[in-house]
Interface confidence: low
Amino acid sequence: QEGKFSGPLKPMTFSIYEGQEPSQIIFQFKANPPAVTFELTGETDNIFVIEREGLLYYNRALDRETRSTHNLQVAALDANGIIVEGPVPITIKVKDINDNRPTFLQSKYEGSVRQNSRPGKPFLYVNATDLDDPATPNGQLYYQIVIQLPMINNVMYFQINNKTGAISLTREGSQELNPAKNPSYNLVISVKDMGGQSENSFSDTTSVDIIVTENIWKAPKPVEMVENSTDPHPIKITQVRWNDPGAQYSLVDKEKLPRFPFSIDQEGDIYVTQPLDREEKDAYVFYAVAKDEYGKPLSYPLEIHVKVKDINDNPPTCPSPVTVFEVQENERLGNSIGTLTAHDRDEENTANSFLNYRIVEQTPKLPMDGLFLIQTYAGMLQLAKQSLKKQDTPQYNLTIEVSDKDFKTLCFVQINVIDINDQIPIFEKSDYGNLTLAEDTNIGSTILTIQATDADEPFTGSSKILYHIIKGDSEGRLGVDTDPHTNTGYVIIKKPLDFETAAVSNIVFKAENPEPLVFGVKYNASSFAKFTLIVTDVNEAPQFSQHVFQAKVSEDVAIGTKVGNVTAKDPEGLDISYSLRGDTRGWLKIDHVTGEIFSVAPLDREAGSPYRVQVVATEVGGSSLSSVSEFHLILMDVNDNPPRLAKDYTGLFFCHPLSAPGSLIFEATDDDQHLFRGPHFTFSLGSGSLQNDWEVSKINGTHARLSTRHTEFEEREYVVLIRINDGGRPPLEGIVSLPVTFCSCVEGSCFRPAGHQTGIPTVGM
C-alpha cells in the first residue's frame, strides 16, 4: 500500500501508543539508486531498528514517561556506505495511556484555619502528581473529600476545589466552626485521574489534619466615656486586634464629622483624643479597619460604639428674657394662668436636667404677697388667693428660681390683669355671598376679607379675634390670617382647589377670643358667618403618585420579568396611556394601560446602576396633556464578570541567561461589585505542564507573583497561562496569558539585532 506504509525517504512523523507490544512495521522506505541500504541514528534507545532494505520497526513496548518523543534520523547509503540521501528527520510521538496512578506529594498534610474565615477562601492545598500526560484525561486529576471527622449533624464544614486541591470552608463552616467546641478536624482526601469520570481511573488518598484557631477580630463592647474629661488626652478607651501581627489599623468615620475625636495606633489601641461634649454629640459609631502591607482590607470592618455619659454641666435656661401671661379680673382661685417651660441641655429624664420651680419674689405685693403659686415640677402658674382687680394693680412681675441639682437660674414673668371677657365677637356681615374661582388659582392668594369686632379691652386676649373655618373645608384648602391691630381676617388658599372633588363649598366661619368668656356669656349666631365658594374646571395634566419611582432587581433577571410599575391619575377622570422616554439602552418596555414595566433585554449592572428613565402619562382623549416622572431601576450585582488582568502586561522580560530564579508581580481585577473588602481572587497556573517551569503565589486579594522555578530557559518568548478565580457565587474563572520573553540584554534592556522582529519587550525583571 504505497504511501501509507511504504514510500521514498522524506521527513515523517508517526504516533504510537505506549505500552503496546510491537504488532506491525512502522514504515518501509524505498531506495532510489544509487542508494542500496538505510541507516538509523538518533534517540533509538535500542528500540527502533531499520533493516538494510529500509524496513523501520520497533522491537519492544514504548514508555511515554521515559521519552515522549523520539527524534530519529534515517539516511540512504550507496554500496560503499556513503550517504547519498538524507539524513531526514523521523519523529516518533509516543501517545499516552493511563499507566500511572496519581500520588499525593505527602501522605499527611497539616493546616490551620481561623473561625469565621471567608467561605471559599483556600487555607491549604493538597497536591498530587501523575506521570501521565496532563493534556489527556489520563493525567487530569480530580480531588474529593472522602470523609470529614467529626461530622456534626451531617454538615460539611470543609470543601475542596476538585481541580486545584484548594481546601476552604463552606458557608456552614464559616458560621459554625468554634475552637472552644471542637479545635481539630481530620479529612480524608482522594485524588483520581481520568478527571474522576471513569470506573477505570487510578486513585490515591491522603490525610489532612486541620486545627481551628480563634478569630480575635471581633467588635469590642460598647464604650462609655464621661463628657468634659479633665484627664490628659489621648485616653485609651478600647482595642481591636487582627489575628496576626503586622496589620495596618485605621478608623473610618462614616458620619464625616467636622471633628473626629478618635485615633488608633498600630497596636490596635483606640483612643479618644480630646474631651467630648455630650450636648454636641451623645454617641459615636465608627469603624476599625485592618489592612495588609499593600493597603488591602484583611477582613470586614468592626463597628465601634462610644456613648458619651452626661455630667451636670448645663444650668437651666429661661424660654425668653420675660414671659408674659394674661389673667382676667374675675378669674377663680386655682385657675391656670400659663406654664413657664425652662430648658436644660443635660440628658433628658435624668437628675441633671430635672427642674424645680419656685417663686422668689412678687412685685408689687398688693393687695398682698403670695397671690400666685407655681407647681414645683410642672412650672404651671395658678391664682392662689383671690381674684385680681385691674384698677388696683394692672401688672405683676414675678421672679422665679428654676434649679437642677447643681445650678440655679432666675426667670422673669410678667402677668397682665385684663378686663373680663364679657363681650363676644360680632361679624359685620353674616353672609359674604358667592365667590367663583378657577381651580388653578395660585396658592397664597387672598380671596376674601372678613371682619368682626369685639367691645372688650383693646389689645388683650379678651378682644383679640381668631377666625376658624368650622364647616365646608374638610380638606383644609383655605385658611384665615388675622391682622392683630384691626382684627381683619384674610381668607387665603392654602392647598390647590379642585373642581373634581369640591365644585361648590359652603364655608362657615367662627370668630372667637383666645381668652375664655366669663361665666354665663356664650358665643351666638353673631359670631358666625358664611360664604359659598364655586370652583370652575381647568383641564389638568395627569398626576403621578410619586415624583420618583424606584425598583430593585438582580441584573440577571430573565427577559420579560416585571421590574416595577408606575401609577398616575387624571384629575378629570380620563384614561391614561403610559410610555417611556430616555430608555437609551433599550432595556425596558411599559404596559401602556397598567403602567407595569418589564425587561426586554439582558440587564447589566456594570453598564451603570441605577438605570434612569422617564415615564410619561398622557390623557387619552381631551387635550392629550401629559406629565413626566422618573423611574430608577437599581440593579443588584451578580457575579457575571470573570477576573482579568488589570492592565496590559505585554513587554515583560528576563535577561537571558538567568543568573537566579526571578519573579514579577501582576494585578487582577473584574467588573463586578466589591464592597468594603475588595476582590479576593485566587491564582493558579493555567495548565499542569507549566508547573515544572513556573510558580504562582498569591500576595493579596488582587495581586500575585509569577516566579521561575529554575534558570534553564531558552532565549525565546514563553506564554504563561494563569487561572484566576473570583470565589464568587457562582465562582467565575478567567484564564489570562502573561507573555514573558527571555532575551539577551544590553544595559538592562532587551538587545535586538537590526531587522529583528518588532514588539520589543519594554519591562525588565
Partner: nanobody, 118 residues
Amino acid sequence: QVQLQESGGGLVQPGGSTRLSCVSSRTFSYYDMGWFRQAPGKEREFVALLSWRGNNAEYSDSVHGRFTVSRGNTQNSVNLQMNNLKPEDTGIYYCAVTYGVARSVRLWGQGTQVTVSS
C-alpha cells in the same frame, strides 16, 4: 480639594544638579509619592517613586544612579535630587500620588519645567 505643589527646577548646565520638591495638602496612608516627566513631543514617563512608608524607592533605568528620591520634612512631601543632568532629562516634571504595584496615578501636580542646556 487636595492639591500637589511642585517647586524647583529651571535652567541647569549639563552635568549639573538641581532639586525638585513636592508637598501634598494632605497625608495619604498606603499611597506612594513619586515623579513622572514629559519631554517635548513625547509621552509622560515614570521617573522615580517612594513607597508610603519611605522604605522603598524605585527608579526608571534612565535615571538610576543619578537621581535620588527622598521624603521631605513631613510624611506628605517628597524630594527629587537630580545629579549629573543630561540634555535628554529636559522636560516637565510632575509630582504624583500613586497606588499599588501598577503605579496607578490618583493625583497629579501642575508640573515644573527642568531645562538642561549649555
